[in-house]
Interface confidence: low
Amino acid sequence: MKVTGIFLLSALALLSLSGNTGADSLGREAKCYNELNGCTKIYDPVCGTDGNTYPNECVLCFENRKRQTSILIQKSGPC
């Protein structure tokens, strides 16, 4: 009984961890699209899971690369 409980808890923990990167939970991953150049200056803001507004998806993606973070897109539009 105890072993089953521990197994279930572990499975739930794993599910919740993997859910953090899913599009249906916290948000979706920002894409850089073309890695050779910088981002355009087109203002089409996205709200990051860090609570900050980024001018476009590309900017958030490159910020992630620069800072070695994994901030997701919480929603389109400003936070």
Partner: antibody, heavy 120, light 110 residues
């Protein structure tokens, strides 16, 4: 997938123009929509656009008298232009702006255009 | 401002020949450039995007090149159906723009 502009017509100087672009087959949450016009015998002129997020941006000449809005439920994007003059006589196009791809930004789907004539 | 200058304004080419149209940006726009073809009384048609990527369904006789401020559209093996006006458009900046399009180049096929 298509975009279609509402009917244009004859307007008087100082009138306000409102055009509607109806989109079908794709979501306004996934694509930007741009407005472009073309005066008779002239080239293409960018008016502005509304992004996936609902943020609007405008050409510098259009900023003071143009407003672009959208209704995601009705799948429509509207262009409102105030203080019309004869110089605003043109065919007005709406077009889908795929700006997701960043340097791949392009107007890949165009309406047939609608003629707006401003004359007293 | 990000201004686009197209040259020449008009060009005449024989069937089977090659035509080159240039587009210059006043500031660097990376490769965020598209080319369109427009025939009289018709809507513009996307030919090239990302400076060099061929749009779906477009003949490989059309090709684009360039980055930064200098761009080129080349039409090889010109056909009568290529008679049209061609426009470049920058997709790099939207907040400081008079016109995202170049002035156009009329291609006359003889």
């Amino acid at each position: 997938q298509s975009v279609k502009e509402s009917e244009g017509g004859l307007f008087k100087p100082t009138d306000t123009l409102t055009l509607t672009c109806t989109v079908s087959g794709f979501s306004l949450s996934s694509y930007a929509i741009s407005w472009v016009r073309q005066a008779p015998g002239n080239g293409l002129e960018w008016i502005g656009a509304i992004g996936k997020s609902g943020s609007a941006y405008y050409a510098s000449w259009a900023k003071s008298r143009s407003t672009i809005t959208r209704n995601t439920n009705l799948n429509t994007v509207s262009l409102k232009m105030t203080s019309l003059t004869a110089a605003d006589t043109a065919t007005y196009f709406c077009a889908r702006w795929d700006s997701v791809g960043w340097t791949d930004a392009r107007l890949d789907l165009w309406g047939q255009g609608t003629l707006v004539t401003v004359s007293s | 401002a990000y201004d686009m200058t197209q040259t020449p304004a008009s060009v005449e080419v024989a069937v089977g020949g090659t035509v080159t149209i240039k587009c210059q940006a006043s500031q660097s726009i990376s490769t965020a450039l598209a080319w369109y073809q427009q025939k009289p009384g018709q809507r513009p048609k996307l030919l090239i995007y990302g400076a060099s990527k061929l749009a779906s369904g477009v003949s490989s006789r059309f090709s684009g090149s360039g980055s930064g401020t200098e761009f080129t559209l080349t039409i090889s093996g010109v056909e009568c159906a290529d008679a049209a006006t061609y426009y470049c458009q920058q997709g790099y900046e939207t907040s400081n723009v008079d016109n995202a399009f170049g002035g156009g180049t009329e291609v006359v096929v003889k």
